[in-house]
Interface confidence: medium
């Protein structure tokens, strides 16, 4: 499934994502946008022969277990095929569990590259939450 | 237990095309990644690509791109490679395997023969 | 694309032999590299897995080492259903690639 802006953030917002860690929803859907492109079935190969999964991008070789990646932690204790559901549910909790992990939101490239100290409040201007 | 069982032997005509199928058993299948695998003798083994059957994603190498287009069904938990405008150059034995980084679980093969 | 190489292409051995396989890549692949056995008319056989581990069910006989380009497969005193053709396969990026096998023949 491919989310509209507000569509997304009303999700997240529902799932518990605003303000969590001190991270305004902003953040989250503007992560989204450049992670995935709202895509919850994005798929991306890493050089190290990992894959990143929905459309929060989440990693094969530390949070989920596709069945193929050497080494791999799957400290979410799940299949990465759950993070490609329409249903954002298991995105979000691994989520969650990764922005706890100490480096917060930085843990995902784009929103680094892309979000951090940019007005993400935009991501969520005009959509009624 | 792991099954991935093939569909049979085709005799295809230059120019035509083919869909090979690939049924799995024994796990859930929208969660493993499907690869395709060809098998010329004299040429060894070539990667052709892969599925995700839950998402649909798919990777091809570069050179099968055109050539082969994956599906999946997992209402039948089949996986299915198409291979379009045959040549000579087609006629070999495709394997499925699960792709777990190596492939512990294949498919019995499909032997594929391109003559007119 | 990762190359691998595998040598010789052709060994003759003796049962009771014991014989070393190479396969070499054409880059660093860490220890992302698998060996499979073919029998004629048969789906490959996974081996080894992650260069040295051991597949469940594969006798003991059978070893792997190396690691980043350079890898190995052993078979300690090779028995009459060893003969066969032997590849390696990696997995450390894409496309995934095969070496061109080792025929283990009967002398």
């Known amino acids: 499934k491919v989310f509209g802006r507000c569509e997304l953030a009303a999700a997240m917002k529902r799932h518990g994502l605003d303000n969590y860690r001190g991270y305004s929803l902003g953040n989250w859907v503007c992560a989204a946008k450049f992670e995935s492109n709202f895509n919850t079935q994005a798929t991306n190969r890493n050089t190290d022969g990992s894959t990143d999964y929905g459309i929060l991008q989440i990693n094969s070789r530390w949070w989920c277990n596709d069945g193929r990646t050497p080494g791999s932690r799957n400290l979410c204790n799940i299949p990465c095929s759950a993070l490609l559901s329409s249903d954002i549910t298991a995105s979000v909790n691994c989520a969650k569990k990764i922005v706890s992990d100490g480096n917060g939101m930085n843990a995902w490239v784009a929103w680094r590259n892309r979000c951090k100290g940019t007005d993400v409040q935009a991501w969520i201007r005009g959509c009624r939450l | 237990q792991v099954q991935l069982q093939e569909s049979g032997a085709e005799v295809m005509k230059p120019g035509a095309s083919v869909k090979i199928s690939c049924k799995a058993t024994g796990y859930t299948f929208s969660t493993y990644w499907i690869e395709w695998v060809k098998q010329r003798p004299g040429h060894g083994l070539e990667w052709i690509g892969e599925?995700?059957?839950?998402?649909?994603?798919?990777y091809y190498n570069e050179k099968f791109k055109g050539k082969a287009t994956f599906t999946a069904d997992t209402s039948s938990n089949t996986a299915y490679m198409q291979l379009s405008s045959l040549t000579s150059e087609d006629s070999a034995v495709y394997y499925c395997?699960?792709?777990?980084?190596?492939?512990?679980?294949w498919g019995q093969g499909t032997t594929l023969t391109v003559s007119s | 694309d990762i190359e691998l190489t595998q040598s010789p292409a052709t060994l003759s051995v003796t049962p009771g032999d014991s014989v070393s396989l190479s396969c070499r890549a054409s880059?660093?692949?860490?220890?992302?590299l698998h060996w499979y056995q073919q029998k004629p008319h048969e789906s490959p056989r996974l081996l080894i897995k992650?260069?040295?581990q051991r597949q469940s069910g594969i006798p003991s006989r059978f070893s792997g080492s190396g690691s980043g380009t350079d890898f190995t497969l052993s078979i300690n005193s090779v028995e009459t259903e060893d003969f066969g053709m032997y590849f390696c396969?990696?997995?450390?990026?894409?496309?995934?690639?095969f070496g061109g096998g080792t025929k283990l023949e009967i002398k």
């Open positions: 992650y260069a040295s």
């Open positions: 395997a699960r792709g777990d980084g190596n492939y512990c679980y």
């Open positions: 880059q660093s692949i860490s220890n992302n």
């Open positions: 599925i995700l059957p839950g998402s649909g994603s798919t």
């Open positions: 396969q990696q997995s450390n990026s894409w496309p995934r690639t």
